[in-house]
Interface confidence: medium
């Protein structure tokens, strides 16, 4: 195997596009005067206190005596999580609701993508049918004993063509009933506004997220949700894993809308997603937070990667570049200095849009906590990995340390974590337990040994369901659902029993 944090790692995927697609344009170079330099330096020093230095995360791979996150004595930690640790579980609307055109719901880009791109899948109607069997979901939540339930609202179920006019009454009723039921059970709702199911009409009329018109439309939709549901929702997520929306939706074509090969479109989409998130955060902060007193963030997903040789600086450069180009792409504007990472700006200057100074100011700090997703969607689809000698790693603890170092130790909600099993596995999902124990152990070590401020954990997922490009070939639920059955009973898997015990004991007891 070729040494290094090899190309083919997420963040270096642009090498799979022809170089013709990266057209050259000149950058403006500024000659800074002495006064300007001193002002910039002062601002940087101030910013350093707020954001940490970009590049600090590199220490994790270096042989740095001040940072050794894993040593032999720490391989497993028998301890409890902090008191009031926030235990939860999550689902995505498109993955579990079913009923894709029932009761006035409009089609989403994924409903369309399923029909045009996925073999042997006719629709999500064969899924867990959460839209029909809401009570069964609530019973499953009761069984586990979670503190919160993270779910997403299907935009086209509320507004069939995406435009905020009169809401679809049945859709509104469904989410209102769900929220009321959660509040009644003392389960905190964490609501995601956009988990990839863009109304198809917005794709067809505007080109979807490629068009900045969507920013205001998304803000209108968010405003409606805040108005209708904000009295019961204290935690909001604007967008789930925008990296995958941009990269796989418009780069590889593996996700809806299935466009591929246009690198400029990938980064335009990313740009619009960031601006949409920022607009919604400011909207919530100004108009809703004063009386609803909630928190709002965006879920950012990432892989983790290790150099084959920690003493080789070039390998470490590549690892840092890989993380910066995936997680930093979105985290830097929102949790960092308000702009794209410097390395991305340099390397992708011909296709990466530019934030104005006013926009940088507007983007910066538009998250009340760091919502982090760590799961197979950021690893598994990259079939280039084995070929290119990449040394990927499921080390959630080190990924959390990287976030701590890069973004000045933010409060972190693990907004999605878990692995997957083969579709043939029913309730005896021993691999899922092994993975969950491993991940939870890493989170506990991050909290207790590295002083990382993780305040909550979202196991993914509550139910087996539609798993995007993998459709129904894998399962991620803690509850087994027979998709061919009429009643879609939720049967607790071994992992559900295990997670229930973890929650009850608030960690690992000896």
């Amino acid at each position: 195997m070729k040494p290094g944090c090899a190309a083919g790692s997420p963040g270096n995927e642009w090498i799979f596009f022809s170089t013709d697609e990266i057209t050259t344009r000149y950058r403006n170079t500024m000659s800074n005067g002495g006064l300007q330099r001193s002002v910039i330096l002062s601002a940087l020093i101030l910013l350093r206190a707020v954001t940490g230095f970009s590049g600090d995360g590199r220490a994790i791979w270096s042989k740095n005596p001040n940072f050794t996150p894993v040593n032999e004595s720490q391989l497993f930690l028998y301890d409890t999580f902090p008191k009031n640790f926030f235990w939860g579980i999550g689902t995505g609307a498109l993955q579990v609701e079913g009923s894709w055109k029932k009761d006035g719901k409009g089609p989403s880009i994924w409903d369309h993508f399923i029909h045009t791109h996925l073999k042997n899948v006719s629709s999500t109607n064969g899924s867990s049918d959460s839209y029909i069997f809401l009570e069964k979901d609530l019973s499953a939540l009761d069984f586990i004993g979670v503190s919160f339930y993270q779910f997403s609202i299907s935009w086209p179920r509320l507004f069939p063509d995406g435009i905020v006019t009169v809401a679809n009454a049945k859709g509104l009723q469904y989410y209102s009933t769900l929220l009321d039921a959660l509040v009644l059970r003392n389960i905190e709702p964490i609501v995601t506004l956009y988990h990839w199911d863009l109304p198809l009409a917005l794709q067809e009329k505007y080109g979807g997220w490629k068009n900045d018109t969507i920013i205001d439309i998304f803000n209108d939709y968010a405003t409606y949700c805040f108005q209708m549901f904000g009295d019961r929702v204290k935690y909001w997520i604007t967008i789930h894993n925008p990296y995958l929306v941009a990269w796989h939706g418009y780069g590889t074509g593996m996700h809806a809308p299935g466009e591929k090969g246009n690198l400029a479109a990938v980064y335009t989409v990313g740009h619009n997603l960031i601006k949409a998130h920022s607009k919604v955060w400011h909207n919530y902060n100004t108009h809703f937070r004063p009386h609803q007193k909630g928190w709002l963030s965006i879920t950012l997903g990432s892989h983790w990667i290790e150099p084959n040789r920690s003493e080789n600086t070039m390998d470490i450069f590549k690892c840092q570049q890989s993380m910066v180009s995936v997680l930093g792409w979105f985290a830097n504007p929102i949790h960092g200095d308000g702009d794209y990472p410097e390395g991305m700006r340099k390397k992708l200057f011909s296709v990466l849009p530019i934030f104005s100074e006013a926009e940088k100011h507007e983007m910066r700090g538009t998250a009340d906590f760091f919502a982090f997703s760590f799961g197979p969607n950021n690893f598994k689809p990259l079939n280039t990995m084995a070929k290119m000698g990449q040394n990927v790693s499921l080390n959630l603890r080190e990924a959390l340390n990287w976030i701590k170092l890069e973004y000045n130790n933010p409060r972190i909600l693990i907004a999605e974590n878990g692995w997957f099993t083969d579709s043939r596995v029913k309730t005896e999902d021993t691999t899922a337990i092994y993975m969950m124990k491993n991940f939870l152990s890493q989170v506990l070590q991050a909290i207790r040994l590295d002083e990382i401020r993780v305040f909550g954990y979202t196991a993914w997922s509550l139910l087996d369901g539609f798993e995007w490009q993998d459709a129904y070939t894998i399962r991620r639920g803690l509850f087994y659902v027979d998709f061919n059955s009429k009643q879609k009973e939720r049967k607790p898997k071994s992992s559900a029993h295990y997670y229930k015990q973890i929650i009850r004991e608030n960690g690992f007891s000896l």
């Epitope: 190309a7 590049g55 600086t313 470490i316």
Partner: antibody, heavy 123, light 107 residues
Framework: QVTLKESGPVLVKPTETLTLTCTVS??????????VSWIRQPPGKALEWLTH???????SYSTSLKSRLTISKDTSKSQVVLSMTNMDPVDTATYYC???????????????WGQGTTVTVSS | DIQMTQSPSSLSASIGDRVTITCQAS??????LNWYQQKPGKAPKLLIY???NLETGVPSRFSGSGSGTDFTFTISSLQPEDIATYYC?????????FGGGTKVEIR
Amino acid sequence: QVTLKESGPVLVKPTETLTLTCTVSGFSLSNPRMGVSWIRQPPGKALEWLTHIFSNDEKSYSTSLKSRLTISKDTSKSQVVLSMTNMDPVDTATYYCVRVDTLNYHYYGMDVWGQGTTVTVSS
Amino acid sequence: DIQMTQSPSSLSASIGDRVTITCQASQGISNYLNWYQQKPGKAPKLLIYDASNLETGVPSRFSGSGSGTDFTFTISSLQPEDIATYYCHQYDDLPLTFGGGTKVEIR
């Protein structure tokens, strides 16, 4: 304005040690994105990378010359020093000191070069 | 060490000609490749980074392409001031290495 200037002897005898100093201005050697490399070029021949010092004092050396090279820096004086032991006539070359911009650990390139200093090895 | 093989070692072309130089790496280096121009008696100058990105202020007649092991450097229309030796340089792995150079002359 960023500049690098090499200084040192123009003539050294075989078996002696060559010591070259690179004095930089316009940027700081402690800047986490900057490093300095030494590169040489024998008359009429290609460029050959010798060594590099990163901002955190990590060092890297050419495989074939590793045993003869030492690189160090004095941040307060804005200087990088190259030592090369056991000089031989084949080491006659122009020696360049080069700034390497790594853009917060995205290696980007040798963007500013010194004018070079010609060193002749002869008895 | 990664060997960089540049060809041709020298070429002669007329003003306005399209000039192409190739560089082959002994193993895959992704797009971790730069191109430098060195005029007689001068220090080299960075022209292209990451295989295809033009450095600020470099004329658009210069371009680069390729990834993995095979790379190409092109001057779309040769100008008198382009008389120089051109070097490829890999930074995929340490030690850093250069190609043997291609000397471009006017016919």
